[in-house]
Interface confidence: low
């Protein structure tokens, strides 16, 4: 019997260049008569062009929706009704080839061709792309608020904000032919629900989406996006009603930046330079191809690539890489954005060097990628430390914290978080090392205390990069480093003269002079600690809600003891900058740290002084009794305390705490409290300091109140941000 052929709609989008017409501003206004008349003619021409080819039998409908420069560019879409079995045969490439062939066949023809009656179409300027019915619907929904802008070389064009009566707007952007467009988006409100999508073509084609951003992102307050060429579209979808534009858009044409380099590395270890995608930190463009060739001076070395919040992974089944494709020595790897540091180590087996290629495989792109490169010793990649094969990083070994995701840095330890005597491998606690009293059989714990030693897990690194054996030598009144750097920046950690904490006692004025109260509209929200003349440290989760993200809301009080009254030693500050740790993850509480820059420097007094910051190697021994302070609730679910409370807590071994919290405790966390419970931090203490007293009498910041199950519950310890785990970021920001 006869079976009707199944027909399917195939949608195409594209543009063509008209050589005998010129673009005028009238053509940007859809309501103008010039626009109406030009679209009528262009539409007729487009239909005639398609129906002049063998595609004519499949023609269904078409529309010219916009015009641009060049001398005149028409932007259109059309639909063909194709028999299902021919669908794959009529790819955009085939359709473009058929139309170009038709145009070329009539270039020198004197015969009258309907589609050439008014327009001289440039065969080389025809572009056909795959689209969908959904794309056309998206385009049509923006036509009531459609803006075309041409931006010239050397120009930076600020785009007019959206029409708030519309629910969706489209900015159609065009630049000079051989340049690429760079769009800058800056969020100007703390919270919104607006959505912006950027496309690598003139209209909202899903398959050519570069990126989409949503809702006044705090982690990315400024986004710069590169198109692969001189055309781009930005679509806005309205969020909450607002009379203010929650963003500012500006666009500029930029020249193509070559992304190829040949480098010869020096005969030294550690970072030697940076490779990055063009216009970093802009998003890389959809057709980025970088090729970096690095020559290594000797086969003793391997090449290390240190990434920030980006990792390389093997991709199964040849699927395309959605966040950048890498080929390194013929190995194909896919990039993946992560909230962690990562290093790729490339063993070198030949002097020919190493070629690293980076390609954006699909139109969807992401933040620019930057990588530090350098050499490592192939026979000893991590001197004094452990090479974590999972992420390529060197991590402390046998310090009681599983820094490597697979925990191998804490396996096979003869002495964990203790010093191993040379003579007989007995273990002694770290404070006994270089304390002037021999504890090892032949006194090996007291050897090399006055000289430099190889750097390791518990050694302190001096400013001149040499290391000393004595644990925690900072600010103890005795210079241990040759350059004396262990005794620098020591105006910290001393209590003043003084006569959410559960189970605590009231503090007196000047007892905890680094304690900060972070307030919004006169209400205490979080604790914090003064760490430098203009910097207060606190927990990132204090700013979790969008409504808390703006610096203008916050006031920082120092020298405060009572919430309901002021005393002469108390001072207040506004916040000029708020920086959350770039790896902070709300769900896991990882990297729960933020820095507030005060609007003016503190004047130090008996009531206002900074706490000491520990070095990365500072060891806070489990079992040590430390103190937490804050105005948090005195019982779970209770109101905040009027008086600054203090309570002693015991530092808990990481593996014990990790087990209690079902392995949600990361290396950036530290636990303190008692199995008995009772003494703990509570709501309102967040971000406040956990401090431990060194033998010198100075107080060092060990942690920040972060999270925990309830307050003071038996068997559930308080979990704190481990300062030694985030100290490099703190130092990078503060200095």
């Amino acid at each position: 019997g006869y079976k009707a052929e199944v027909m399917v709609s195939q949608v195409y989008s594209g543009s063509l260049r008209v050589l005998n017409r010129h673009f005028s501003q009238d053509l940007t206004r859809r309501e103008s008569s010039a626009f109406r008349s030009e679209t009528a003619k262009a539409q007729k021409m487009l239909k005639e062009l398609i129906t002049s080819t063998r595609l004519g039998t499949y023609y269904n409908s078409s529309s010219v929706y916009s015009f641009g420069e060049g001398p005149l560019t028409c932007f259109f879409w059309f639909i063909l009704q194709i028999p299902e079995h021919r669908r794959l045969m009529l790819s955009p490439e085939v359709v473009q080839a058929l139309l170009v062939e038709e145009l070329l066949s009539t270039v020198n023809s004197s015969a009258a061709v309907p589609y050439r009656a008014e327009y001289e179409v440039d065969p080389e300027g025809l572009v056909i792309l795959e689209a969908s019915v959904k794309d056309i619907a998206a385009l049509n929904s923006t036509l009531g608020c459609y803006r075309y802008s041409y931006v010239g070389q050397g120009q930076v064009l600020r785009l007019k904000g959206p029409d708030h009566l519309a629910s969706s707007c489209l900015w159609h952007l065009q630049g000079p032919k051989d340049l690429m467009l760079k769009l800058r988006l800056e969020w100007t409100l703390a919270e919104c629900r607006d959505r912006l999508a950027m496309y690598d073509v003139a209209g909202p084609l899903e398959k050519r989406l570069i990126t989409s951003v949503y809702g006044c992102s705090r982690q990315e307050p400024v986004v710069e996006v590169l198109a692969s060429g001189a055309i781009m579209a930005v679509v806005w979808k309205k969020g909450l009603h607002s009379y203010y534009d929650p963003f500012v858009l500006s666009v500029q044409p930029v020249v193509f930046q070559a992304c190829e380099v040949n480098l010869t590395l020096d005969n030294r270890l550690d970072s030697q330079g940076v490779l990055s995608t063009p216009y970093f930190p802009s998003y890389y463009s959809p057709q980025t191809h970088c090729s970096w060739h690095l020559t290594v001076p000797s086969l003793d070395y391997g090449l290390a690539l240190w990434f920030d919040a980006y990792a390389l992974r093997r991709q199964k089944y040849d699927l395309p890489c959605t966040q950048g494709q890498w080929t390194i020595q013929n190995r194909r790897l896919c990039g993946l954005r992560i909230l962690q540091p990562y290093a790729e180590r490339i063993p070198v087996v030949a002097t020919a060097g190493i070629t690293i290629n980076f390609t954006s495989q699909i139109s969807l792109t992401g933040p620019g990628v930057r990588v530090h490169y350098g050499l490592y010793n192939q026979s000893d990649p991590c001197p004094g430390e452990f090479l974590c094969s999972v992420n390529g990083l060197c991590v402390p070994a046998c310090d009681g914290v599983k820094d490597c995701p697979n925990g191998l840095d804490e396996r096979n330890c003869v002495c964990r978080a203790t010093f191993q005597c040379k003579e007989d491998s007995t273990c002694i606690s770290l404070p006994k090392v270089c304390d002037g009293q021999p504890d090892c059989l032949n006194g090996s714990d007291e050897e090399q205390c006055q000289e430099g030693v190889p750097c390791g897990t518990f050694t302190f690194q001096c400013e001149d990069r040499s290391c000393v054996k004595k644990p925690n030598p900072q600010c103890d009144g005795r210079p241990d480093c040759r350059d004396g750097s262990d005794e620098e920046h020591c105006d910290c950690g001393l209590q003043g003269p003084s006569s959410r904490i559960v189970g605590g006692a009231v503090s007196s004025e000047g007892e905890w002079p680094w304690q900060a109260s972070l307030q919004v509209r006169g209400r205490h929200i979080c604790g914090g600690a003064l760490i430098a003349d203009r910097w207060v440290i606190t927990a990132a989760h204090c700013f979790q809600e969008d409504s808390m993200a703006s610096t203008v809301l916050w006031t920082v009080f120092l020298g405060k003891v009572w919430q309901n009254s002021r005393w002469p030693g108390e001072v207040s500050f506004k916040v000029s900058r708020l920086l959350l740790h770039p790896y902070h993850e709300e769900d896991s509480h990882d990297y729960d740290v933020a820095l507030l820059q005060l609007d003016h420097p503190v004047v130090r007094s008996a009531a206002v002084r900074p706490v000491c910051l520990p070095a990365r190697s500072h060891f806070f021994e489990p079992g040590l009794h430390c103190w937490i302070t804050g105005w948090g609730a005195l019982r779970e679910g209770g109101p905040i305390s009027n008086a600054l409370q203090k309570v002693d807590v015991q530092l808990i071994p990481q593996d014990l705490c990790s087990e209690v919290y079902r392995y949600q405790v990361t290396p950036r966390m530290l636990c303190a409290g008692y199995r008995k419970g009772k003494k703990d931090a509570c709501q309102g203490d967040s971000g406040g300091p956990l401090v431990c007293k060194a033998l010198s009498g100075r107080w060092f910041l060990a942690g920040l109140v972060s999270w925990g199950l309830g307050c003071g519950r038996p068997n559930y310890f308080g979990v704190y941000t481990r300062i030694t785990g985030v100290i490099s970021w703190i130092q990078q920001v503060v200095t």
């Epitope: 964990r416 273990c427 002694i428 071994p653 014990l656 008995k676």
Partner: antibody
Framework: QVQLVQSGAEVKKPGASVKVSCKAS????????MHWVRQAPGQRLEWMGR????????TYSPKFQGRVTIIPDTSANTAYMELSSLRSEDTAVYYC???????????WGQGTLVTVSS | DIQMTQSPKSLSASVGDRVTITCRAS??????LAWYQQKPGQSPKLLIY???TRHSGVPSRFSGSGSGTDFTLTISSLQPEDFATYYC?????????FGQGTKLEIK
Amino acid sequence: QVQLVQSGAEVKKPGASVKVSCKASGFNIEDYYMHWVRQAPGQRLEWMGRIDPEDAETTYSPKFQGRVTIIPDTSANTAYMELSSLRSEDTAVYYCARSIYLDPMDYWGQGTLVTVSS
Amino acid sequence: DIQMTQSPKSLSASVGDRVTITCRASQDVTTALAWYQQKPGQSPKLLIYWATTRHSGVPSRFSGSGSGTDFTLTISSLQPEDFATYYCQQHYSTPYTFGQGTKLEIK
């Protein structure tokens, strides 16, 4: 200095109960857990249970659950252990000890010999 | 309950010797392990806790190591007053449990 002084030796008949006291000096029992541990002749140490005198919260070893009761008298800075339904295998030296929260028992009483015999 | 097994059960050594006693837990106790010394007719005395931390007043010749399930008590140079019975105890979870003891005798 820290001291735990226990009551004197006891001889009991099977089925009876015994109550041993442990008086602390040099520290406040409310700040610590108070434990009871016993040691039968030639045997290993056996943990019986503990109390948090601050709120009288107790944790007992399943082996002694139902037979042992530990109670505090914070005003006298003393802890008591009562063991009921005595049998001959309960003959042992009973020790009280203190611990700070997570740590093990750092100070012990001198021990009280309880003999169960008919 | 977590079972604690000590070895050896008894040990003869001379003054000045280096002695090692081991303790194995039937499951992971992280570093929550203590060592006690007990002399006849006396109550136990705490030597080491958290596997490696010496209790105040304990001579430096006593040291502890290990984590997870395997632990060691080392006496680097035996003194006459060290001859006693040594017990390990896990303070990881209740009911707290002790090893059966290691009796250290004079050779």
